[in-house]
């Protein structure tokens, strides 16, 4: 009874619903189940898809964009408990823009163990109202449930039994009202005497067994559970897992074998982002923590004396780091067999992330290639890197060899970083932002000094766009439209004119003028220049006619403040010496030009004569908004309307004081028509400083989740399946 | 067959502390809530306190919290209920009961006399 | 808590007859979880009734419960003998159970 189905990995189920069938054995999913992206779906593609046997998802349920689901109640008719082990910005059930659902329908879900509700933008969504989240989730007040259908009043949400006039549902109260409970109305709301907690409970209200989770067959029984508070065991569910067993995934016990499994799987496998399972403090886990080591025998985790020591070994003696993904099967190493190649051309958060997975290495046996990483701005990450013996050396007898990385600045702090090279020599070539003393204080520091053969550090293609040396460049014009700024700045000629190769012209979004030059830590952040490349001007005899070397920005965005600057690119003098010349960072504004359209209409009608209309202010207002023009039509009734019998329900009209789910300061401040009574004598007060926070915070939150959401749901497209069975690992 | 059987009541002076045992037979013990339920002479029914299987959770009668403390000993198969304060309202035979699905009470004991008086 | 008023006091019927005990909450109940015991004079109470309208084993069918929110009932369609004694609802929706006064039922 307890989990009749197969045990399935986390999914991500997109574009069309081919993979859905994928879930018809499982009864548990050990990950995340995320649905999404079907913009071609209909509502009798879902007629006859039911998954009766899914009762539990360790993680979390998120549903996006998926166009003609009406219910889940066919769909999941049996899911009990969401755990939410991992979750999805703190939410354990995700509904977000599910353009046709009516209502959620998760008749049986009675659990949700960690994490939030987040049920946002669903323009048909009804029956919000009567769920009680409170006997579903404790974090009650972190649920966000907003911009629904139900928000407007305008559900004729019934209960089973309203029409006929009997109360069939259970009733709670609410803001001290008894409000009935139900999913549809079809199916009531189940919920069990208090002293139950969250074990579940029989039709009757009696308590499951203190193991159970949710929901049970029968009282006081631990294998009669629909689900499991703690650990399940061999159709038992068990507060901790006795010897032999292993927690595993916090839900489940597994003996050695199974564990031993996956880590040789793994270990066997070249599958990147696998994990070599461990054993530690009876649980079968990903990785041994921090301050441990693997014990190779019997995969235990034991303590280490000082530091721990990770030596790994590299397949076919190199490694690639090419991505965040591929440092983070380094993490924790301390000491790399083998060498190491930096590729890095683009990622996130790079810095931090190469830190954290590469920032523990201490020792290379082989050699450290930097290679084209061109996302790269210090070797700093390598945190304690003090030793590169070169037992291994790259073709040309290089220990160290550093090619083509466009924007590397600084290898490490050399007044902090201690770094000995054993054998090998260096090699430093087109690294153009990379100044010659940095190079040689390398050679100093890491004991190669006097190894370096003539070409082996290029003279002329380190450093040759770094502003090793600086005069002054002053801007002389500056002319602004909505999307463009021409620039003029004074001419510059080093002593060889010929030396000039041009001009670097860099620039970038600054809301505030609080811009560095080296802002971001790495060349793809999200506050790194944009850089053009600008020829140097014709040069003429006479110094009082010199052109004005300068340039057009275009493309840029309207009644936005940009940070700009300006510096030479110049070639080697045969003494070494680099003559160049950059500005101070300036900021200029563009231009105002039209706004992009509001956002969000809402509409309701406060009368039989009467629509009220608001909106929110667009996202790109492009200037100062001084007012909006409102265009109307008359359309076709929708026949559902009249087929919906209102008064069972007993509907309120809205009051005059109605007001939209979202109130924000923008528009507030944007749409200034309040609607007042006919008199003409009310006026809605002012809003307080703490009320306007709160929206502003509010509406901050709302884009945060947003962006969180596209940057997780919108991936390139790859030919690859949901977590194999094989990488138990978290989804 | 269920049995249920209390001990430890008796005669005691207003203030003062009594203990009452229950040893239980005929069941897995330590599967089961129990609970403890009081009748006054002559009165209805009035519930007292409640232990789940464990001993992890504890519920008391408004009447009562603060001075009475329910425990259980799983390994000795045996429920108690420490009275401390007594008052001359807590006079009552005191039942035993074993509880089903923790909430409804579906075997009682035979009760043991309380009997608070100066 | 709540509080659970049972009525009448003392119900006299004769033996073959049908009878109606009423029990009232305070406060709704959220879902049907009363039920009902019943004690004959020296004897421990013994379970008939719970969810409101669920018989407990070897609970003869004549015994019958109904009712939702505040008001419940139990229901005796043939009264026999044995059935004189003193009936309880007791509900279980808060954690704090409570008990009725009781209901005598007596032989007229």
């Known amino acids: 009874h307890l989990y009749p189905g197969e045990v399935c990995p986390g999914m991500d189920i997109r574009n069309n619903l081919t993979r859905l069938h994928e879930l018809e054995n499982c009864s548990v999913i050990e990950g995340h189940l995320q649905i999404l992206l079907m913009f071609k779906t209909r509502p009798e593609d879902f007629r006859d898809l039911s998954f009766p046997k899914l009762i539990m998802i360790t993680d979390y349920l998120l549903l996006f964009r998926v166009y003609g689901l009406e219910s889940l109640k066919d769909l999941f008719p049996n899911l009990t408990v969401i755990r939410g082990s991992r979750l999805f910005f703190n939410y354990a059930l995700v509904i977000f823009e599910m353009v046709h659902l009516k209502e959620l329908g998760l008749y049986n879900l009675m659990n949700i163990t960690r994490g939030s509700v987040r049920i946002e933008k669903n323009n048909e969504l009804c029956y919000l109202a009567t769920i009680d989240w409170s006997r579903i989730l404790d974090s009650v007040e972190d649920n966000y449930i907003v911009l629904n259908k139900d928000d407007n009043e305008e559900c004729g949400d019934i209960c089973p039994g309203t029409a006929k006039g009997k109360t069939n549902c259970p009733a709670t109260v609410i803001n001290g009202q008894f409000v009935e409970r139900c999913w549809t109305h079809s199916h009531c709301q189940k919920v069990c005497p208090t002293i139950c907690k969250s074990h579940g409970c029989t039709a009757e209200g009696l308590c499951c067994h203190s193991e159970c989770l949710g929901n049970c067959s029968q009282p006081d029984d631990p294998t009669k559970c629909v689900a499991c508070r703690n650990f399940y065991l061999d159709g038992r569910c068990v507060e901790t897992c006795p010897p032999p067993y292993y927690h595993f995934q916090d839900w489940r016990c597994v003996n050695f074998s199974f564990c031993q499994d996956l880590h040789h799987k793994c270990k066997n496998s070249r599958r990147q982002g696998c994990h070599q399972y461990v054993i530690h403090n009876n649980k079968c886990i990903p990785e041994c923590p921090s301050g441990y080591t693997m014990n190779s025998s019997n995969l235990l985790c034991t303590p280490c004396l000082g530091p721990c020591p990770k030596v790994c070994h590299l397949l076919e003696g190199e490694k690639t780091i090419d991505s965040v993904t591929s440092a983070q099967e380094l993490r924790g190493c301390t000491v790399i067999n083998g060498s190491l190649i930096i590729n890095i051309r683009g990622g996130n958060n790079l810095a931090a992330e190469l830190e954290a997975n590469l920032g523990l290495i201490e020792e290379i046996s082989g050699y450290l290639k930097i290679r084209r990483s061109y996302a790269l701005v210090s070797l700093s990450f390598f945190r304690k890197l003090r030793l590169i013996r070169g037992e291994t050396l790259e073709i040309g007898n290089y220990s160290f060899y550093a090619l083509d990385n466009q924007n590397l600045r600084q290898l490490w702090d050399w007044s902090k970083h201690n770094l000995t090279i054993t054998q090998g020599k260096l090699f430093f070539h087109y690294n153009p932002k990379l100044c010659l003393s940095e190079i040689h204080k390398m050679e100093e520091v890491s004991g190669t000094k006097g190894r370096q053969e003539r070409n082996d550090i290029a003279l002329k293609t380190n450093g040759d766009q770094a502003s090793c040396e600086n005069e002054l460049l002053k801007f002389s014009y500056i002319r602004t439209s909505f999307d463009k700024i021409l620039l003029r700045w004074e001419p510059y000629w080093p002593p060889d004119f010929r030396d000039l190769l041009g001009f670097m012209l860099f620039y970038k979004e600054a809301p505030y003028q609080n811009v560095t030059e080296f802002d971001g830590q790495d060349a793809c952040g999200s506050n790194s220049w944009t850089v053009v490349d600008i020829d140097p001007p014709l040069r003429s005899n006479d110094p009082k006619s010199q052109n004005h070397p300068g340039w057009l920005m275009r493309g840029l965005k309207p009644w936005t403040q940009y940070a700009i600057f300006v510096k030479t690119l110049v070639t080697f003098s045969d003494e070494r010496r680099t003559y160049g010349a950059k500005s101070d960072i300036i900021y200029v504004q563009t231009d105002a030009t039209n706004p992009s359209v509001p956002l969000d209409p809402i509409s309701v009608s406060n009368s039989s004569s009467q629509i009220i209309l608001k909106w929110k202010p667009p996202s790109d207002p492009n200037g100062n908004i001084t007012h909006y023009l409102v265009f109307w039509e008359r359309q076709a009734e929708d026949s559902e309307l009249f087929e919906l019998d209102y008064c069972l329900k007993g509907l309120k009209l809205p009051s005059r004081t109605w007001s939209p789910p979202f109130e924000s300061e923008d528009s507030q401040k944007h749409n200034q028509s309040e609607y007042e009574d006919s008199a003409g004598e009310c006026c809605s007060c002012p809003k307080t400083d703490s009320q306007i926070l709160k929206e502003l915070e509010e509406s901050s939150f709302r884009k945060t989740f947003e962006d969180y959401l596209h940057n997780v749901v919108f991936v390139p497209r790859k030919t690859s399946s949901g977590t194999g069975a094989e990488d138990p690992r978290p989804s | 067959e269920v049995q249920l059987v209390e001990s430890g009541g008796g005669v005691v002076q207003p203030g003062g502390s009594l203990r009452l045992s229950c040893a239980a037979s005929g069941f897995t013990f330590d599967d089961y809530a129990m609970h403890w339920v009081r009748q006054a002479p002559g009165k209805g029914l009035e519930w007292v306190s409640l232990i789940s299987w464990d001993g992890g959770s504890t519920y008391y009668a408004d009447s009562v919290k603060g001075r009475f403390t329910i425990s259980r000993d799983n390994s000795k198969n045996s429920l108690y209920l420490q009275m401390n304060s007594l008052r001359a309202e807590d006079t009552a035979l005191y039942y035993c009961?074993?509880?089903?699905?923790?909430?409804?009470?579906?075997?009682w004991g035979q009760g043991t006399l309380v009997t608070v008086s100066s | 808590e709540i509080v659970l008023t049972q009525s009448p006091g003392t119900l006299s019927l004769s033996p073959g007859e049908r009878a109606t005990l009423s029990c009232r909450a305070s406060?709704?109940?959220?879902?049907?979880?009363l039920a009902w015991y019943q004690q004959k004079p020296g004897q421990a109470p013994r379970l008939l009734i719970y969810?409101?309208?669920s018989r407990a084993t070897g609970v003869p069918d004549r015994f019958s419960g109904s009712g939702y929110g505040t008001d419940f009932s139990l229901t005796i369609s043939r009264l026999e003998l044995e059935d004189f004694a003193v009936y309880y609802c007791q509900q279980y929706d808060r954690s704090q159970i409570t008990f009725g006064q009781g209901t005598r039922l007596e032989i007229k």
């Open positions: 969810g409101a309208g």
């Open positions: 406060q709704s109940l959220s879902s049907s979880f």
């Open positions: 009961a074993k509880a089903r699905g923790v909430v409804i009470i579906d075997y």
